[in-house]
């Protein structure tokens, strides 16, 4: 039950995180005009990864896309790449984790396969979250650097080449969305990896063995709790019976930790 909950929660947290990464990537407010020096401006500038916008006090907003690739700073390109990689990995991770969910039955998929898929999706979520956090952090660092730089020899708007007195920009809402979303995706990924450990089979080479003792029918499973009174608790996954008993088909199977009798 705990494994299912951990896996399910990990999936939901990652889903929210990836939705946040997508939202942050699409948002226009990665950097917003710093109003400290001019709080009475009637024109407000803000920029995203894909376009820059100007909102006039009168309510009109005009956005212009960066229609150049070569004219854009390498750092901006790197941030775009990191965010896209994060989204792609996250999306694949979500797809894999859907099939890995313990509560969803797909054919006769074994727990070992589900465990592997859970681990794969968990790693994908972790990398996705790290990509988003890295992307947002690189952009934030770029803003901090530009903020303190002299106003000359700087891009006006991310894609422009005109050297004018530069409007100073500070952190926009998208950065905070990105950081939180990346963190959630990372946490979700860790939870999936933890859930994978619970899903993974115990390394034992026998199945449940049952025998009769003084009229009591007692069935044991490795790793399980005692099935009837009269024996000490066996919660440490010790072997209960080391005889050569095998089940009818003599095929090895790996029972789940929580398949109690």
């Amino acid at each position: 039950m705990a494994v299912t909950a951990c896996q399910g929660l990990g999936f939901v947290v990652s889903l929210i995180g990836i939705a946040g990464i997508i939202a942050a990537t699409c948002m226009d407010q990665w950097s917003t005009q710093d109003l400290y020096n001019n709080p009475v401006t009637a024109v407000f500038n803000y920029q995203g990864l894909w376009r820059s916008c100007v909102r006039e006090s009168s309510g009109f907003t005009e956005c212009r896309g960066y229609f150049t690739l070569l004219g854009l700073p390498a750092m901006l390109q790197a941030v775009r790449a990191l965010m896209i990689v994060g989204i792609v990995l996250g999306a694949i991770g979500l797809l894999v984790s859907i099939f890995a969910l313990k509560c969803i039955r797909i054919g006769s998929m074994e727990d070992s396969a589900k465990a592997n898929m859970t681990l794969t999706s968990g790693i994908m979520f972790i990398v996705s979250g790290l990509c988003a956090i890295a992307g947002v952090s690189v952009f934030a660092n770029m803003l901090v650097t530009n903020f303190w730089m002299s106003t000359a020899n700087m891009y006006t708007g991310m894609g422009g080449m005109v050297q004018t007195v530069q409007t100073r920009y500070t952190f926009g809402a998208a950065l905070f969305v990105g950081w939180v979303a990346g963190g959630l995706t990372l946490i979700g990924g860790v939870m999936m990896c933890i859930a994978c450990r619970g899903l993974a089979p115990e390394e034992t080479n026998y199945k449940a063995v049952s025998y009769h003792a003084s009229g009591h029918s007692v069935a044991y499973k490795p790793g399980g709790f005692k099935a009837s009174t009269g024996f000490g608790s066996n919660t440490k996954n010790k072997k209960i019976y080391d005889g050569g008993a095998r089940t009818e088909d003599e095929v090895q199977s790996y029972p789940s930790k929580h398949d109690y009798v």
């Epitope: 001019n38 009475v40 100007v54 409007t167």
Partner: antibody, heavy 117, light 113 residues
Framework: QVQLKESGPGLVAPSQSLSITCTVS????????VSWVRQPPGKGLEWLGV???????NYHSTLISRLRISKDKSKSQVFLKLNSLQTDDTATYYC???????????WGQGTSVTVSS | DIVLTQSPSSLTVTAGEKVTMSCKSS????????????LTWYQQKPGQPPKLLIY???TRESGVPDRFTGSGSGTDFTLTISSVQAEDLAVYYC?????????FGAGTKLELK
Amino acid sequence: QVQLKESGPGLVAPSQSLSITCTVSGFSLTTYGVSWVRQPPGKGLEWLGVIWGDGSTNYHSTLISRLRISKDKSKSQVFLKLNSLQTDDTATYYCAKAGRGNALDYWGQGTSVTVSS
Amino acid sequence: DIVLTQSPSSLTVTAGEKVTMSCKSSQSLLNSGNQKNYLTWYQQKPGQPPKLLIYWASTRESGVPDRFTGSGSGTDFTLTISSVQAEDLAVYYCQNDYSFPLTFGAGTKLELK
């Protein structure tokens, strides 16, 4: 079409308050801003203040202590209240709609206000 | 506050003549975000409210004759009337629409000879 019409008292005594109403039609006060501008007789234009679509206001620094601009969206009316009037507040008061570039694209005909005892 | 200085204060012209008037700002009105200058030109005829002619320093308002042209950037702006008509006799004001308060220039009065 867009229209703005000011209505004021005409004559106000010194130290009293001036209240002017600007009734608008053809546009929404929740979307567009409305500015107030005055023009003393034979002189130039003076921007007083503005109320934006979101309800925020900006005032001229010299009038900030005695000027208040508000609106009633349901009645499509914008209000100007100027306190502690002096004789140099005598002017024609205009309300105007803010458009692209923050420019005032539609103006009312103005209302003449004389401050005199 | 941004101060706008208009020159000349008055102009006497003959019909058909080309006219230019200047507006200088104490601070740059160029917004780096969209490379637009937030300067507006108005025309005010006697006994009438002002009428919007040009915004963003050079964008003509719809319905304004194309003989009116706005130009300039940063702090120096010019309004040009390519061929003055009798109906153009008015006072022309420039306005800062970039920073509050949205100040006006003192105006340039256009008169006929």
